[in-house]
Interface confidence: low
């Protein structure tokens, strides 16, 4: 039982502290009172707190807790946000380089294809960017579209330059023939495999980083329960009611209170650990065909090889396509 | 063989990026991120302790507050009495996580499963198929240059890693880094409403 306050005890000290929290002094008693209406700072004797003060302390305690939580996660949040932005931009740069490499290959090796090839290559790499960012695009379709678009141009410009420019009718037939005759050999399949694997991994890597940000944001902005507010108030502010302005909470007591307040948040721990370890596993596997940088920056060479493959088989192909698309060609020459 | 595409860099900064030898690579940057993230692997389980160490707690004082009275820092009462007659701490824990936390746990489960699927053989079925089709004939040298494309005269060496950071300049200015702003962080002043 604490000694009763002296007969001349006042609540001046408490009042001057409380004034910083809540300008307007009418809530603080002049002298210690029984405090029978208090619900959190239950008095063992006369107290300098009122019910209204208690409510204010609870509000402040919860705010403090929210600030402390945000401060705790600031470094982690910054790390993930910064890296998510860095990698997103880096992947965009890789895509831009890959496009430039491929365009350069066309310009230097197949200048007659360039205007159209640039357009198709541009569309392909735009789709690559969208896919990395999470768009519902199918990688196989992207690759097929690239080769479907390239082949009519290769056929009319390199293999059969005598055809008129308005080869619209034959284009459709050539697009179909491209797949049926496996005009580019296995190269489209190779590119599909490499591109889809490397982009899938890249996309999920970015997705995981963005979810990491969402996790931190969620726990960063948690609203603490009334029960927690009461516990925090008892720990941080109830001492003031007894005029004990300079004392601090006991360490063990603080840990018990925090574990109570954060019981829900701590449940994330298991999945957070697994998240970091799974992300590490993914990153360790991001090499060779699982490394989009490696795959995309080498695409120009594979596409070049695929065109060489077409040129090697040009004679046989021209004959077959001549028969296959004869109907379209006759209509054109008329 | 394919003409090395060096003269069609639409923006000239790319040349600088492609040929810087000592900048970080994307893969080293990824590994660095993982190492930093791993230092936060216990972030959530360590939160209660972290918050106590960053809020006013009696460290050197002989006496401390246990929620009801002033006690000696090492006495039994220091941790126990404050919880009496208030509400059951166990009950508080039993309420389980808030819906918003449950939702984020579900999302983490989803992404963890996805990450595992991509890392496990189940997500990597095509490795051997590639070799069977004869598209990959092993790595080309054991440095970080990698051979790309077919064999024969079509093969050229491309620098495997893009030295992208020369262009990115990702390091923030010191002024932008957290804790260096003029705004007082809770760590600096122990929250403006604590007056010790």
């Amino acid at each position: 039982q604490p000694p009763p306050p002296p007969p001349d005890a006042t609540c001046h000290q408490v009042r001057s502290f409380f004034q910083r929290l809540q300008p307007g002094l009418k809530w603080v008693p002049e002298t210690p009172v029984p405090g029978s209406d208090l619900q959190v700072c239950l008095p063992k004797g006369p107290t300098c707190c009122s019910r209204k003060m208690e409510e204010k302390y609870q509000l402040t305690a919860r705010l403090n807790m929210e600030q402390l939580l945000q401060s705790a996660s600031m470094e982690l949040k910054f790390l993930i946000i910064q890296n998510a932005a860095v990698f997103q931009e880096a992947f965009e740069i890789v895509v831009r380089h890959a496009k430039n490499y491929t365009n350069a290959m066309f310009k230097n090796n197949y200048p007659s294809l360039t205007p159209q090839a640039f357009e198709f290559v541009g569309e392909f790499f735009t789709d690559v960017s969208l896919y990395i960012l999470g768009s519902d695009i199918n990688v196989d379709d992207m690759v097929n579209e690239l080769f479907d678009s390239l082949f009519p141009v290769i056929y009319t410009q390199l293999m059969n330059p005598g055809l008129p420019d308005s080869a619209l009718d034959i284009n459709e037939c050539l697009r179909g023939a491209r797949r049926d005759l496996k005009v580019f050999g296995n190269f489209p399949k190779l590119i599909m495999t490499q591109v889809s694997k490397s982009l899938q991994v890249t996309r999920i890597f970015l997705q995981a980083l963005n979810l990491g940000i969402e996790v931190i944001n969620t726990t960063d902005h948690l609203k603490f329960s009334k029960d927690c507010g009461r516990m925090l108030t008892r720990m941080w502010y109830c001492s003031y009611c007894q005029g004990l302005m300079m004392v601090k909470p006991c360490g063990g007591y603080c840990n018990v209170v925090m574990q109570g307040c954060m019981a829900g948040v701590v449940e994330i721990d298991k999945y957070w650990r697994e998240y970091i370890l799974s992300l590490e596993e993914l990153v360790n596997g991001m090499y060779r065909i699982y490394d989009m940088e490696n795959v995309l920056l080498g695409l120009f060479s594979t596409i070049h090889d695929s065109i060489q493959y077409v040129q090697k088989n040009a004679g046989k192909l021209t004959t077959t396509i001549g028969k296959l698309c004869a109907h379209s060609q006759q209509r054109q020459y008329r | 063989s394919a003409y090395y595409p060096e003269d069609l860099f639409i923006d000239k900064k790319v040349l600088k990026v492609a040929h810087v030898e000592h900048e970080e690579t994307l893969s080293s940057r990824r590994r660095e991120l993982i190492q930093k993230l791993k230092s936060f692997i216990s972030f959530y389980s360590a939160l209660p302790g972290y918050i106590c160490s960053h809020s006013p707690v009696a460290e050197n004082d002989t006496l401390c507050w246990n929620g009801q009275e002033l006690v000696e820092r090492y006495s039994q009462k220091a941790a126990r009495n404050g919880m009496k007659n208030q509400f059951n701490l166990h009950e508080l824990k039993m309420k389980g996580p808030e819906p918003v936390v449950s939702q984020i746990i579900d999302k983490l489960k989803h992404i963890n499963q996805l990450l595992r699927t991509m890392s496990m053989p189940k997500g990597r079925v095509l490795d051997k198929n590639l070799d069977e089709e004869g598209f990959e004939s092993g790595d080309c040298g054991d440095d970080e240059d990698e051979c790309i494309g077919g064999s024969g005269d079509g093969m050229i060496k491309v620098k495997n890693q893009l030295r992208f950071l020369a262009e990115l300049a990702y390091d923030l200015d010191v002024d932008d880094a957290p804790g260096n702003s003029q705004q007082a962080t809770p760590k600096d002043n122990e929250i403006s409403t604590f007056h010790n």
């Epitope: 999470g134 | 989803h110 996805l114 699927t117 079925v125």
Partner: antibody, heavy 120, light 108 residues
Framework: EVQLVQSGAEVKKPGSSVKVSCKAS????????ISWVRQAPGQGLEWMGG????????NYAQKFQGRVTITADELTSTAYMELSSLRSEDTAVYYC?????????????WGQGTLVTVSS | QSVLTQPPSVSVAPGKTARITCGGN??????VHWYQQKPGQAPVLVIY???DRPSGIPERFSGSNSGNTATLTISRVEAGDEADYYC???????????FGGGTKLTVL
């Protein structure tokens, strides 16, 4: 907790179009993939197409290609599905469903469904 | 294109275990999700990634997936479990979701 609230039941004539809305609340709308799934009376679930609001590009099932248009308005966190050239076999309950990110995540939240009746 | 085959109906006595199968070529290599749909209501996710349970779904619901069959198991079946159950995978070639035909679970 994400909540998806759909527009009310519709009765339409064959040959006309219907536009069903799906308003999302409680989540980051732009990063969710919103799909539309329909269920004819006494039948199973059939995926029609989907959209990720942050990209705006939609992806459709082959069967509905050319007849369905899926859009999203980030400002109002609302996704729309418009089905044209309606026929009696389009009579069904149309659901919107959301999922986190990309394949192969499940549809974790569903709207209450919108009954569209096509009848002359 | 993936095709998923489910039995049209399964009957089980209260308190017993119900098993609903979902057949598909090499389905074990895919992630399977299960949905419960009660009459007049929207589907509800009950199992995802073969065997994970969303919060709020009783532990009585479990899943497994290997070879050519995925299975949803409901132990200690209750009257409230009576519903249609659908399996779903993502078809990797089209990147589109595919649903099974559905199984009506009747609690006797």
């Amino acid at each position: 907790e994400v909540q998806l609230v759909q527009s009310g039941a519709e009765v339409k004539k064959p040959g006309s179009s219907v536009k069903v809305s799906c308003k999302a609340s409680g989540g980051t709308f732009r990063s969710y993939a919103i799909s539309w799934v329909r269920q004819a009376p006494g039948q199973g679930l059939e995926w029609m197409g989907g959209i990720i609001p942050i990209f705006g590009t939609a992806n459709y099932a082959q069967k509905f290609q050319g007849r369905v248009t899926i859009t999203a308005d980030e400002l109002t966190s609302t996704a729309y599905m418009e089905l044209s050239s309606l026929r009696s076999e389009d009579t069904a309950v149309y659901y919107c469903a959301s999922r986190i990110g990309q394949w192969p995540t499940p549809f974790d939240y569903w709207g209450q469904g919108t009954l569209v009746t096509v009848s002359s | 294109q993936s095709v998923l085959t489910q039995p049209p109906s399964v009957s089980v006595a209260p308190g017993k275990t119900a098993r609903i199968t979902c057949g598909g070529n090499n389905i074990g290599s895919k992630s399977v999700h299960w949905y419960q749909q009660k009459p007049g209501q929207a589907p509800v996710l009950v199992i995802y990634y073969d065997s994970d349970r969303p919060s709020g779904i009783p532990e009585r619901f479990s899943g497994s997936n290997s070879g050519n069959t995925a299975t949803l198991t409901i132990s200690r079946v209750e009257a409230g479990d009576e519903a249609d159950y659908y399996c779903q995978v993502w078809d990797s070639s089209s990147d589109h979701p595919v649903f099974g035909g559905g199984t009506k679970l009747t609690v006797l």
